[in-house]
């Protein structure tokens, strides 16, 4: 059962796993949610009746029954982890804590103009977990405006104390605001020979990389595959760090794989969700339950629905035994990973999908697409919406993309002459315009947010957000697309598609069926040559064939230029402008979304 509210002046008795320090009960709840075993917590707020050494303690707890006895205690705040909840979860914490000093290893000290600048510095520093900033009112003159970057083994402070005229806060890496590079490559036959901060068992290098990503101290990893010569080290995932933030030594070793934490790209890549099945593989761990199940998929469902289950092993039924049902072993461990992985015993293993909600919905795989052809099929572009105006009559106005459960990203130029958001309707999950009837459900628009530097499409800043009146329930036919990572600025996208219901030639009409076209990206230098009368800025991105023939056109505006990278679709561009449609040597010009990620997050995450 999902319980989100906090229980004031209440303490849960027993079940302690560990104690950490957090600046608020709300953040204690987040820490509990991300801990592999924590189901409940008790936080101690600052209070004259409480020993100051216990202020800000966050005791993480577990219970076989998923609850614990409650005791009245002043200044104690208790609650439950969000593991039991189905809603999207984020570790992003933008709060600034006034007059609190969050203790940790102070590894960097520098002058900063403001707490915001200090927080940005922390976000863009590979080691930084949190910071403390001495304001200009700080009593000690030599410490004023000093920004201390800090890290700890756990990612949370080792202690928190009251200190006048300082402010503290956390790195915004988990808010997708880091400019650090996002290195997704996994290097085969490579061992990184730096210090290990931890080691866990993992079935493959991908799971190892994801574990590294949400481990607070891990910057890179080495994984020994099941063919690794030393048997005791097979399936071992070594979590590593270094002072420079990069591996100091790379050793060529067969059957080992190495890679980097995906911290800077975690909002657009699954890092918690291990959805694969591992055949002929047994995961060992503490046994939670043994249940009969028809298949390994059914076993995974059972594990996902059991809040304490972290992973499972399914042993298929022996011929006609137990109504064809096999045994499903639900398991857990102290760190969420198997204590040992065995091969060749016929089991099928995997992980709970409960943690998938900690990943961005946009990373979910969508159904395979039909290659070739210009008409799309249902569910092929589930982020694509059709934006209708009701003035003078109801009609398709522009395309748009779902980027959050209340947010559509589109082009600013779509709203010329639109005097109120009320006259707009957003339809999602649509393939054919003819499906839209008077009684078709739609999303009303609460607010149109146009970039304040927008003047006209050709001069850039052609970007707008629509805040919907109600939230979108994600399904196979309507779900978000990932924003590109700022760390992905140098990625060369090779699989890009433009979609929309727009004209197929300059003098035409809106198409009934959603059209798609695969279009190659064009460098900005090349694009500038084709548009000598315009300034093609780095905030624009161009796409098109030299010979023309495929392009976006009238009515496609605001829609996505979607590019697939590492199996995840990213919203690389917003259809903006061009000279004619599909003309030779006249590429389409799109708003370069990666350059507006900060603006998007600022507007969509505003309280």
């Amino acid at each position: 059962e999902c319980v989100t509210q906090l229980l004031k002046d209440t303490c849960f008795e027993g079940g302690d796993i560990t104690t950490v320090f957090t600046p608020s009960a709300k953040y204690c709840q987040v820490v509990c949610t991300y801990h592999p075993r924590c189901l409940l917590f008790t936080f101690t707020a600052e209070s004259p009746s409480e020993d100051p050494t216990r202020w800000f303690t966050c005791v993480l707890k577990d219970s076989v029954t998923e609850t614990l006895p409650r005791v009245n205690r002043t200044a104690a705040i208790s609650g439950y982890s969000f593991k039991q909840c189905s809603h999207q979860i984020s570790a992003c914490n933008k709060d600034i804590y006034v007059d609190l000093d969050m203790k940790g290893i102070n590894y960097n000290s520098s002058v900063a103009k403001s707490a915001q600048e200090c927080q940005e510095r922390c976000t863009d520093d590979v080691h930084c977990h949190f910071f403390t900033y001495a304001t200009r009112q700080f009593p000690s003159l030599e410490h004023r405006n000093i920004c201390l970057l800090k890290h700890t083994q756990t990612g949370t402070p080792t202690r928190i104390t009251k200190l006048d005229k300082v402010v503290s806060g956390f790195s915004l890496k988990s808010c997708a605001l880091s400019n650090l590079a996002c290195i997704r490559d996994i290097f085969p036959n490579t061992v990184f020979a730096d210090s290990n901060i931890d080691s866990v068992m993992a079935p493959d290098a991908f799971v190892c990389g994801r574990i590294c990503t949400h481990h607070p101290g891990c910057l890179f990893f080495t994984f020994f595959s099941q063919e690794w010569p030393k048997e005791s080290q097979r399936n071992l995932c070594l979590l590593k760090t270094s002072e420079s933030g990069l591996p100091s030594t790379r050793i060529k070793k067969s059957k080992a794989l190495s890679g980097f934490s995906l911290q800077s790209c975690r909002h657009s890549i699954p890092v918690f969700c291990h959805s694969s099945f591992y055949h002929d593989t047994d995961f060992l761990g503490e046994e939670l339950d043994i249940v009969a199940a028809k298949s390994h998929e059914a076993c995974q469902k059972l594990c996902t629905n059991a809040v304490r289950c972290q992973f499972f092993t399914y042993t298929p039924a022996q011929a006609s035994c137990n109504e064809g049902k096999g045994k499903c072993y639900l398991k857990l461990s102290s760190n969420g990973s198997p204590t040992k992985i065995l091969h060749g015993r016929g089991g099928i293993s995997g992980y709970t999908l409960r943690l998938c909600k900690m990943d961005n919905e946009c990373t979910t795989k969508i159904k395979p697409r039909i290659v070739g052809g210009t008409a799309s099929v249902r569910g092929e572009w589930p982020w694509q919406v059709t934006l209708h105006t009701t003035s003078p009559t109801q009609r398709h106005l522009c395309g748009g993309s779902i980027i959050g459960n209340q947010w559509i990203l589109t082009a600013a130029h779509c709203f010329y002459g639109v005097e109120s958001p009320k006259i707009l309707r957003v339809y999602s999950g649509i393939l054919n315009q003819s499906e839209i009837k008077e009684d078709t459900s739609f999303f009303g628009v609460q607010e149109i947010i146009i970039h304040d530097q927008y003047k006209m499409a050709e001069s850039g800043y052609d970007i707008a957000l629509l805040k919907l009146e109600t939230t979108v329930n994600y399904t196979d036919s309507q779900r978000p697309i990932c924003l590109p990572s700022k760390g992905d600025r140098n990625v060369i996208y090779t699989d890009c598609w433009v979609t929309g219901w727009g004209y197929r030639k300059l003098r035409d009409k809106i198409q009934n069926t959603l059209q798609k076209a695969k279009i190659p990206l064009v460098t900005n230098e090349e694009c500038q040559k084709r548009y000598r009368g315009h300034k093609i800025t780095h905030k624009m991105i161009c796409a098109g064939y030299r010979e023309g023939g495929k392009d976006a056109c009238k009515g496609d505006s605001g829609g996505p230029l979607s590019c697939k990278h590492n199996e995840v679709w990213h919203l690389v561009g917003i259809t903006s402008w061009g000279e004619g449609c599909a003309q030779r040597e006249r590429p389409g010009v799109y708003t370069n979304v990666v350059e507006y990620v900060d603006w998007i997050l600022e507007k969509t995450q505003a309280v």
Partner: antibody
Framework: QVQLVQSGSELKKPGASVKLSCKAS????????MHWVRQAPGQGLEWIGN????????NYDEKFRTRVTLTADTSTSTAYMELSSLRSEDTAVYYC??????????WGQGTTVTVSS | DIVMTQSPSSLSASVGDRVTITCKAS??????VSWFQQKPGQAPKLLIY???NRYTGVPDRFSGSGSGTDFTLTISSLQAEDVADYHC?????????FGQGTKLEIK
Amino acid sequence: QVQLVQSGSELKKPGASVKLSCKASGYTFTRYWMHWVRQAPGQGLEWIGNIYPDSDSTNYDEKFRTRVTLTADTSTSTAYMELSSLRSEDTAVYYCTRMGFYAMDYWGQGTTVTVSS
Amino acid sequence: DIVMTQSPSSLSASVGDRVTITCKASENVVTYVSWFQQKPGQAPKLLIYGASNRYTGVPDRFSGSGSGTDFTLTISSLQAEDVADYHCGQSYSYPLTFGQGTKLEIK
């Protein structure tokens, strides 16, 4: 069922103003544009303007912009059209009509306005 | 403003005849054209929307066609109750405009 009921006939002197009403029922008043169209004796239809009751957004034909005011009262689901500085050529039947999903699908019965000295 | 030119302004036909009324827009209005029927002393009634879609309850002898600038309303077999004025109108852009109307009579 959808119904638009308009106020009764008006006889006005040149220079005066007239305010016509159109009460809507049978649908969500705030979700549809209400248009006003007139028809002079023996003539065709002439569009005056429209209003979106949920936001009070309006559009007017340039010809009427300075003399017409469209308003809507969402509490009573009633649209109003006020025409000022009346002249004899404003003598016509005035219709309110709902812009449905596709077109003007429901019309009021019309209000006759006669301007005469 | 978009001018809608309707022709003929009046026509007389016999019951059972095929009747065609045309409407020409001064610029491209895609398919944002409607046709209305207006009987004496009554408000107009919607017949055709989107140039070719018959509105609910309209007999199938009425049909519409066209796109861009040229539009047609056809009555495949004229009935006595079809005596009325017929108006075309565009809702592609503001201001909305109508044709001057066609008066249809029975011979």
